[in-house]
Amino acid sequence: EVEKTACPSGKKAREIDESLIFYKKWELEACVDAALLATQMDRVNAIPFTYEQLDVLKHKLDELYPQGYPESVIQHLGYLFLKMSPEDIRKWNVTSLETLKALLEVNKGHEMSPQVATLIDRFVKGRGQLDKDTLDTLTAFYPGYLCSLSPEELSSVPPSSIWAVRPQDLDTCDPRQLDVLYPKARLAFQNMNGSEYFVKIQSFLGGAPTEDLKALSQQNVSMDLATFMKLRTDAVLPLTVAEVQKLLGPHVEGLKAEERHRPVRDWILRQRQDDLDTLGLGLQGGIPNGYLVLDLSMQEALS
């Protein structure tokens, strides 16, 4: 805590300007009026204050706003944002997307810090949902943002926001997250025609059920192997050889290179070898001719 000392004669700050960088910490404390600082926060960023000096400025704002800073101040914090703790940020009420962008810009190029995570959490909770503009902004700064959310948090994403999602934003999502996002994407894109729909829905298909894959197989979509390999194994297993052939189109030849990996490996084990042979790819491991297939899971459900 900086000692309370009187401001030396002639040193009282009339405005926030570069002359303040020559002030000692105690002089900043004594000579800079907190209300002046609050109204001229936009100037702080342009002045090369030391970290110690920034600590003093933060202290002055904390004294002026013990319940949390107003948004007019928050929007212009600039590098002073890096001095804030998650506890400080929890006191804020950030409603403007411009404020959010300004603070994310300060942290740009770095990993998501606890401060940024808290800021985003406060902002999204304040809005009540992850709307399209917010999602656009967050994924622009942090492409992995969407996949860092829990399925519960993702449930607040309205289908209209899905338009803001780019394929790379889903790269690190696991099946539980895609289970939540896929139905929203399905709803969001349902007015598009077949080929356009597939282009948009493709990245979300790791959350699709079997029947949707069957429907897509009737659409001449030519799914690539990378997408196929990300499908839920249990959604792929019930597909017939003919359906997989239709789903993949010319990419069906890629199954050979993936025959030892899930879901291809598990799917092969469920198919009749005769049916696999019709693909002419030399896939091995199917059910031999003459064997009876019992679906025990269905048997259980029916008993």
């Epitope: 139905p183 059920p209 029916l302």
Partner: antibody, heavy 122, light 107 residues
Framework: QVQLQESGPGLVKPSETLSLTCTVS????????WSWVRQPPGKGLEWIGY???????NANPSLKSRVIISVDTSKNQFSLKLSSVTAADTAVYYC????????????????WGRGTLVTVSS | EIVMTQSPATLSVSPGERATLSCRAS??????LAWYQQKPGQAPRLLIY???TRATGIPARFSGSGSGTEFTLTISSLQSEDFAVYYC?????????FGQGTRLEIK
Amino acid sequence: QVQLQESGPGLVKPSETLSLTCTVSGGSIQNYYWSWVRQPPGKGLEWIGYIFYSGSTNANPSLKSRVIISVDTSKNQFSLKLSSVTAADTAVYYCAREVGRIAVAGWFFDLWGRGTLVTVSS
Amino acid sequence: EIVMTQSPATLSVSPGERATLSCRASQSVNSNLAWYQQKPGQAPRLLIYGASTRATGIPARFSGSGSGTEFTLTISSLQSEDFAVYYCQQYNNWPLTFGQGTRLEIK
């Protein structure tokens, strides 16, 4: 062919929790999305929410705070719990299958259970 | 939420005649509209989806039209088994919502 059958108590006391189960027979619960829809006597239909076999759900905002939808894939069943019920929750409750193969997308219902009447009364 | 309004509440038509039922959405639902038929003591039955596509096994006398906010279900020549309550449902956005129903009765 696939059939749906609702089961559960026909009478629930006010402020208690309504619990219903839908059993899917003749097909796997894993292939589709499954919904609950209700219909108060002499009134229209109201969508309650859906579940995917992985447990992912979505509920009508008007009921969300009181609704829990869950799934038991080993039994090919999904369930509805509606808490703090009042007389306004008296209705026929239907389980329904969200349409599959006939359309690439579309949240409407091509298969319904017969429905079960639940009366909320002390 | 999107509010679906059906009219008329009750429609009286003679067998063999044409019946026209209307459904209006409070905002555009594109063509994401389904029609159902419900008879007393039974579950609803899907008739039409995509505003105009007949579901499997639905007779050709049932037809749907419209897009945006105005939709129509037409039954060209009423059979005795067609007298029931008809509901429209939008699936353009969550929550999924239904109209309050039109009761089609014998005149």
